[in-house]
């Protein structure tokens, strides 16, 4: 997977550390053509005008409908790799010619990432890390996946689950030395099928904060300490992924 | 102690291919990326590519990447960079660093000489 | 692929001067910026990571700053010892670029 890149659609840097939640998180990635609604730029999540709506996101601060996304990311934009065997495809060798959607300027492709796909986090992650993924769940899905990787550990597993028993979950947990923990489980279920969906993930001094289309939905202690070793995000599941970036703020 | 200690300087022909090593010590080598850079004499860096220990993923600098291929050992915590159809223009000092921000360290270099 | 630019190769200072050596993406990197220290006939070293983080045991005299396409390395009282190239990188997209480096010497 070369040349691929943060989205180039980041509203700068240098905020203050964000004060409480919800709330202003600052500068995150606004998103392949943003998203329509959000009353107060740069805001996070859904932050209205400082003053206004306070602890909560505005009315009407996440597009609901689908088309909410233009079809291809922003220039800039992680392409995904291409998909193979197993859960997260690895990229050992030079890719075959066509393994990647044709390309518009910085190497953005032009269509939408490949799932599973990896998120190369080559610092690791540390606190006000800022990570944003959006893209639309598949009509009839059953599951999306986000894998925190710590090496062949996973330190923040967040599975939304479409159809447990006849009832939606999001199962969080973490895997050590290939041992599952014990899991911690959130019935608030934010995702629709066939719908566009914003997912943050705030890295915390003890804790990742989720926040689902402008809106706080969970937090997860950390349980792998070494956050500096989390190096690698693995998103997977019945999704179409538009993009994925990181900044801090 | 993050320690990255990488093989010896080599004098190699013009054609052949050259595999430096880098040998990991001191933290978790499946849970940072390493990365190669190149440093010609006198002149400035550059970024040859990246390898996940963990699962092998690579993420190459376009401009090397018909030149050079990265692999590790996890049984021995080394990073391997092959170096093929050597030129002259590869002779230089190649560097593996680890990534991860906290530690961030370089090894010592290993100097490659390509001469007939 | 981005380009990093610092615009001075060689910075001339005196012991106890400030001095800032800049660094310029030719697009936005979102402040995923390192600075590194190579003083002759030594690996780099890295100073400062996410464009103002100071690596751990970096005197403070080091700081680094800076957002979107402009960042700076400043040294607040430059010591005999800071006699070094340094070089900028940005680790926002692959290939992970770095400047073409600045010399700094020491009058």
């Known amino acids: 997977a070369d040349n691929f890149s943060l989205h180039d659609a980041l509203s700068g840097s240098g905020n203050p550390n964000p004060q409480g939640w919800p709330g202003a998180w600052g500068n995150q990635p606004a998103g392949a053509g943003g998203y329509p609604g959000a009353s107060y730029p740069g805001a996070y999540p859904g932050q209205a005008p400082p003053g206004a709506y306070p602890g909560q996101a505005p009315p009407g601060a996440y597009p609901g409908a689908p088309g909410a996304y233009p079809g291809a990311p922003a220039p800039g934009v992680y392409p995904g790799p291409p998909s193979g065997p197993g859960a997260y495809p690895s990229s050992g060798q030079p890719s075959a010619t066509g393994a990647y959607p044709a390309t518009g300027p910085y190497g953005a492709p032009a269509g939408p990432l490949i799932v599973p796909y990896n998120l190369p986090l080559p610092g690791g992650v540390v606190p006000r890390m800022l990570i944003t993924i959006l893209g639309t769940v598949k009509p009839n899905a059953n599951r999306i996946a986000l894998d925190f990787q710590r090496g062949n550990d996973v330190a923040f597993h967040f599975n939304p689950r479409f159809n447990e028993n006849n009832r939606r979950v999001i199962v969080c947990n973490t895997k050590l030395d290939n041992n599952w923990g014990r899991e911690e489980r959130q019935s608030v279920f934010p995702f629709e099928s066939g719908k566009p969906f914003k997912i943050q993930v705030l890295v915390e001094p003890d804790h990742f904060k989720v926040a689902v289309n402008d809106a706080h939905l969970l937090q997860y202690n950390h349980r792998v300490k070494k956050l500096n070793e989390i190096s690698k995000l693995g998103i997977s599941g019945d999704i179409d992924l538009t993009s994925a970036s990181y900044t801090m703020i | 102690q993050v320690q990255l200690q990488q093989s010896g300087a080599e004098l190699v022909r013009p054609g052949a291919s050259v595999k430096l090593s880098c040998k990991a010590s001191g933290y978790t080598f499946t849970s940072s990326w390493m990365n190669w850079v190149k440093q010609r004499p006198g002149q400035g860096l550059d970024w040859i590519g990246m390898?996940?220990?963990?699962?092998?993923?690579?993420h190459y600098n376009q401009m090397f990447k018909d030149k050079a291929t990265l692999t590790v050992d996890k049984s021995s915590n080394t990073a391997y960079m092959q170096l093929s159809r050597l030129t002259s223009e590869d002779s230089a000092v190649y560097y593996c660093?680890?990534?991860?921000?906290?530690?961030?360290?370089w090894g010592q270099g290993t100097t490659l000489t390509v001469s007939s | 692929d981005i380009l990093m630019t610092q615009s001075h190769k060689f910075m001339s200072t005196s012991v106890g001067d400030r001095v800032s050596i800049t660094c310029k993406a030719s697009?936005?990197?979102?402040?995923?910026v390192v600075w590194y220290q190579q003083k002759p006939g030594q690996s780099p070293k890295q100073l400062i990571y996410w464009a103002s983080t100071r690596h751990t045991g970096v005197p403070d005299r080091f700081t680094g700053s800076g957002s979107g396409t402009d960042y700076t390395l400043t040294i607040s009282s430059v010591q005999a010892e800071d006699l070094a190239l340094y070089y900028c990188q940005q680790h926002y997209s692959t290939p992970y670029t770095f400047g073409g480096g600045t010399k700094l010497e020491i009058k």
């Open positions: 660093v680890n990534s991860n921000y906290e530690s961030g360290y």
């Open positions: 697009q936005d990197v979102s402040s995923v």
């Open positions: 390898i996940d220990p963990s699962d092998s993923e690579t």
